[in-house]
């Protein structure tokens, strides 16, 4: 924007802020039971884990920050079934971790070609 | 729990994960216009800024991670009014920044003081 009217340092600070808000994988706290769609009589300790999920702003209001690639991270958690019939078991739980994000538009019917460099 | 059944290192990793998921102020991307409730003919560049907002997990499902203290951070942004009658103006915009968080019941009898100016 009309850079001549404002000092370069101020513009640099604004630009850095904008870069930091861009759509990208961000560390997020997710609830394991909701994530896995487990029944209410199965729960985990700890109930939440940290993974990366897409978030942030896009250059257009109509675009949505969405994942383009996902890996699955294995987290060691205690799985507890109620009523408690045995010692809580330490189980590996696979949770989706977004590794790539893109600002995507809504598509009415037909898919479109998305090229991710 | 039952630490005797599991090696200390595994329990330590699980505990560290749990600590990191706890309810606390987390850096978040917020859309300025939505935040300020501005009309569509006023917009900002960049449209989003980074601030801290309460997020994370609570020990009980009935609790919600909410802010208990708030400061207001001033961000230098371009405010643009449409139709554009002058050069976009560089303005200080005050955005709420959560400095304290607590796991609170969904409908507390004695509400916590949440400051949202």
């Amino acid at each position: 924007f009309a850079a001549t009217f404002y000092d370069i340092e101020t513009l640099k600070v604004i630009d850095e802020e904008w870069q930091r808000t861009q759509c990208s994988p961000r560390e997020t706290c997710v609830e394991v039971a909701s994530e896995l769609g487990k029944s209410t009589n199965t729960f985990f300790k700890p109930p939440c884990v940290n993974v990366f999920r897409c978030g942030g702003c896009c250059n257009e209001e109509s675009l949505i920050c969405m994942n383009t690639s996902t890996s699955y991270i294995s987290k060691q958690l205690f799985e507890i079934s109620v009523p408690l019939t045995s010692v809580p078991e330490l189980v590996p739980v696979k949770v989706a971790n977004h590794t790539g994000c893109k600002c995507l538009p809504t598509a009415p019917r037909h898919p479109y070609s998305i090229i991710r460099r | 729990f039952a630490a005797t059944f599991y090696d200390i290192e595994t329990l330590k990793v699980i505990d560290e994960e749990w600590q990191r998921t706890q309810c606390s102020p987390r850096e978040t991307c917020v859309e300025v216009a939505s935040e300020l409730g501005k009309s569509t003919n006023t917009f900002f560049k960049p449209p989003c800024v980074n601030v801290f907002r309460c997020g994370g997990c609570c020990n009980e499902e009935s609790l919600i991670c909410m802010n208990t203290s708030t400061s207001y951070i001033s961000k230098q942004l371009f405010e643009i009014s449409v139709p554009l009658t002058s050069v976009p103006e560089l303005v200080p915009v005050k955005v709420a920044n959560h400095t304290g968080c607590k796991c609170l019941p969904t409908a507390p009898r004695h509400p916590y003081s949440i400051i949202r100016r």
Epitope: F1, W18, N59, S62, C103, P105, Y112, I114, R117 | -
Partner: antibody, heavy 118, light 112 residues
Framework: QVQLVQSGAEVKQPGASVKVSCKAS????????MYWVRQAPGQGLEWMGY????????TYNQRFKGRVTMTTDTSTSTAYMKLRSLRSDDTAVYYC???????????WGRGALVTVAS | DIVMTQTPLSSPVTLGQPASISCRSS???????????LHWLQQRPGQPPRLLIY???NRFSGVPDRFSGSGAGTDFTLRISRVEAEDVGVYYC?????????FGQGTKLEIK
């Protein structure tokens, strides 16, 4: 003020490629998506796709079936559109247009006429 | 793809008189975020297009207030309260709710 300066007119043979440039000035180049739109002589507007200059992400109109490539050079604030395997019906004025946060194509280049003839 | 249909295709108008152009989309242009990304462009002879109205009813920078936009869902209208000689050209509606972005076929505004 915002300006989009496009490269000049070109005449190409069928089967060849063309690369149109669009140099932006007067705003933060990485903060806005750049659209490419073409207009055949006496016809309406056709959207080809866009590029996000911040990260190089592109979304193309399926109609161009892998013939189009959009790129940017952030060091010179320039956007490029390359169209391959040209046919006579690709004869058109090719426009670059900046898109505002609210979705309207708010600033346009003057267009680059590409004529495909043998 | 979303088909944008404009009517009329040609509109002969007397100077100083009002004019209106209709645009209908084959599907709703209401985005999942609640906004409607329907825009109007003007293309004068020999010129690139120029943004007039964005998001249904917001006039862009430097656009005279005789231009106004309205509508919702699938039906939209551009109105010119008093046509001036400089308004001659082709008017396009465009949508940026869905991909691919699409345009109406254009309405030619001419003076009687």
């Amino acid at each position: 003020q915002v300006q989009l300066v496009q490269s000049g007119a070109e005449v190409k043979q069928p089967g060849a490629s063309v690369k149109v440039s669009c140099k932006a000035s007067g705003y933060t180049f990485t903060g806005y998506n750049m659209y490419w739109v073409r207009q055949a002589p006496g016809q309406g507007l056709e959207w080809m796709g866009y590029i996000d200059p911040y990260n190089g992400d592109t979304t193309y109109n399926q109609r161009f079936k892998g013939r189009v490539t959009m790129t940017t050079d952030t060091s010179t604030s320039t956007a490029y559109m390359k169209l391959r395997s040209l046919r006579s019906d690709d004869t058109a004025v090719y426009y670059c247009a900046r898109t505002s946060y609210y979705g309207g194509m708010d600033y346009w280049g003057r267009g680059a006429l590409v004529t495909v003839a043998s | 793809d979303i088909v944008m249909t404009q009517t009329p295709l040609s509109s002969p108008v007397t100077l100083g008189q009002p004019a209106s152009i209709s645009c209908r989309s084959s599907q709703s242009l209401v985005h999942s975020n609640g906004n409607t990304y329907l825009h109007w462009l003007q293309q004068r002879p020999g010129q690139p297009p120029r943004l007039l109205i964005y998001k249904v009813s917001n006039r862009f920078s430097g656009v005279p207030d005789r231009f106004s936009g309205s509508g919702a869902g699938t039906d939209f209208t551009l109105r010119i309260s008093r046509v001036e000689a400089e308004d001659v050209g082709v008017y396009y509606c465009s949508q940026s709710t869905h991909v691919p972005r699409t345009f109406g076929q254009g309405t030619k505004l001419e003076i009687k």
